[in-house]
Interface confidence: low
């Protein structure tokens, strides 16, 4: 025997109090799949969150963060404060990168400058708090047409900087 609720489309719920009639989701609620016995409450983007996509009868609202903050977690479950380039977010707020480290983004951690000498290369451009060292070519690499600059090391995920 087919469940009568299976006929209720997204945006409705199967109302047990009304002989399993498909009733539209009430305001500020939604059902994203058919056959639901209840509608879910819409997410509200308050405070540091702002609405990226309004809630509809068939889909939840989506939030992002107000300027000066960026999303963290699945579905932007949190907003984290931006810092300037050359800084990292610590427990006490944004702090400048220590000497020998840099951060070229508004989020993430300060990472150590590339060690050119490990690759046998000279320093072409010194590092700053906001920019990695640029290594020159190895002396043997100086041939016509050879690139004279190596790209900086790729960004690492927070918490994964070498010691």
């Amino acid at each position: 025997l087919q469940d009568p609720c299976s006929n209720c489309p997204a945006g409705t719920f199967c109302d047990n109090n009304r002989n399993q009639i498909c009733s539209p989701c009430p305001p500020n609620s939604f059902s994203s799949a058919g056959g639901q016995r209840t509608c879910d409450i819409c997410r509200q983007c308050k405070g540091v969150f702002r609405t990226r996509k309004e809630c509809s009868s068939t889909s939840n609202a989506e939030c992002d963060c107000t300027p000066g903050f960026h999303c963290l977690g699945a579905g932007c479950s949190m907003c984290e404060q931006d810092c300037k380039q050359g800084q990292e977010l610590t427990k006490k707020g944004c702090k400048d990168c220590c000497f020998g480290t840099f951060n070229d983004q508004k989020r993430g951690i300060c990472r150590p400058w590339t060690n050119c000498s490990l690759a046998g290369k000279p320093v072409l451009m010194n590092g700053t708090k906001a920019r990695d060292v640029v290594c020159g070519p190895r002396p043997a690499d100086l041939s016509p047409g050879a690139s004279s600059v190596t790209p900086p090391a790729p960004a690492r995920e927070p918490g994964h900087s070498p010691q």
Partner: antibody
Framework: QSVEESGGRLVTPGTPLTLTCTAS????????MIWVRQAPGEGLEWIGD??????TTDYASWAKGRFTISKTSTTVDLKMTSLTTEDTATYFC?????????????????WGQGTLVTVSS | DIVMTQTPASVEAAVGGTVTIKCQAS??????LAWYQQKPGQPPKLLIY???TLESGVPSRFKGSGSGTEFTLTISDLESADAATYYC??????????????FGGGTEVVVK
């Protein structure tokens, strides 16, 4: 690389006591250092921390005012005042897994063996 | 303050079995969760950080998962050496988050 706690002993209630965490093989100046205590048969209780790079400290709300964390280049001290029998515990010091002040680095992989503080009349 | 709550307080399983320990944060901590193992008379040992990243030397039998407020530590193919107390630790300090205790209350794992 290691950390070692010292200074734990039997004291009477109300006596102040300072514990010292000594770092070997690394400089405190680039790490979060944490103090945690564990009463006999109980769980881990966070007391507070210091970030060596800036000497900024943070405390659990219950520890504020009675506990003070400070540092030198090779040690981190935990100064305790107005001790009660409830403060009887093993006190651990630990160093963060990664250097740098970011709170993303606030996990601890280098622990001392702990020092026992007994408060009894 | 963010409160870290662990369940169960104690769990018993046989060698070769699987145990699951849950850790709940009272508000979202994104993926900033670590797990520690502590044996009697020893300091805690870091097992997992950033929810699922294994510390070097930790066997792959230990698996961390979750995000936001709900996290799980699963230990499969249990060995007698896994008998210990396990603690979660939240460490998302963004948005002026505070912790009365950054550690959960602990879960004792008994291996039969």
């Amino acid at each position: 690389q290691s950390v070692e706690e010292s200074g734990g002993r039997l004291v009477t209630p109300g006596t102040p006591l300072t514990l010292t965490c000594t770092a070997s093989g690394f400089t405190i100046s680039s790490y979060h250092m944490i103090w945690v205590r564990q009463a006999p048969g109980e769980g881990l209780e966070w007391i507070g921390d210091i970030y060596g790079g800036t000497a900024t400290t943070d405390y659990a709300s219950w520890a504020k005012g009675r506990f003070t964390i400070s540092k030198t280049s090779t040690t981190v001290d935990l100064k305790m005042t107005s001790l009660t029998t409830e403060d009887t515990a093993t006190y651990f010091c630990a160093r963060a897994r990664y250097s740098g002040g970011s709170y993303a680095n606030y996990v601890f992989n280098l622990w001392g063996q702990g020092t026992l503080v007994t408060v009894s009349s | 303050d963010i409160v870290m709550t662990q369940t169960p307080a104690s769990v018993e399983a046989a060698v070769g079995g699987t145990v699951t320990i849950k850790c709940q944060a009272s508000q979202s901590i994104s993926s900033y969760l670590a797990w520690y193992q502590q044996k009697p008379g020893q300091p805690p040992k870091l097992l997992i950080y950033r929810t699922s990243t294994l510390e070097s030397g930790v066997p792959s039998r230990f698996k961390g998962s979750g995000s936001g407020t709900e996290f799980t530590l699963t230990i499969s193919d249990l060995e007698s050496a896994d008998a210990a107390t396990y603690y979660c630790q939240g460490y998302d300090w963004s948005s002026s988050n505070r912790y009365d205790n950054t550690f959960g209350g602990g879960t004792e794992v008994v291996v039969k």
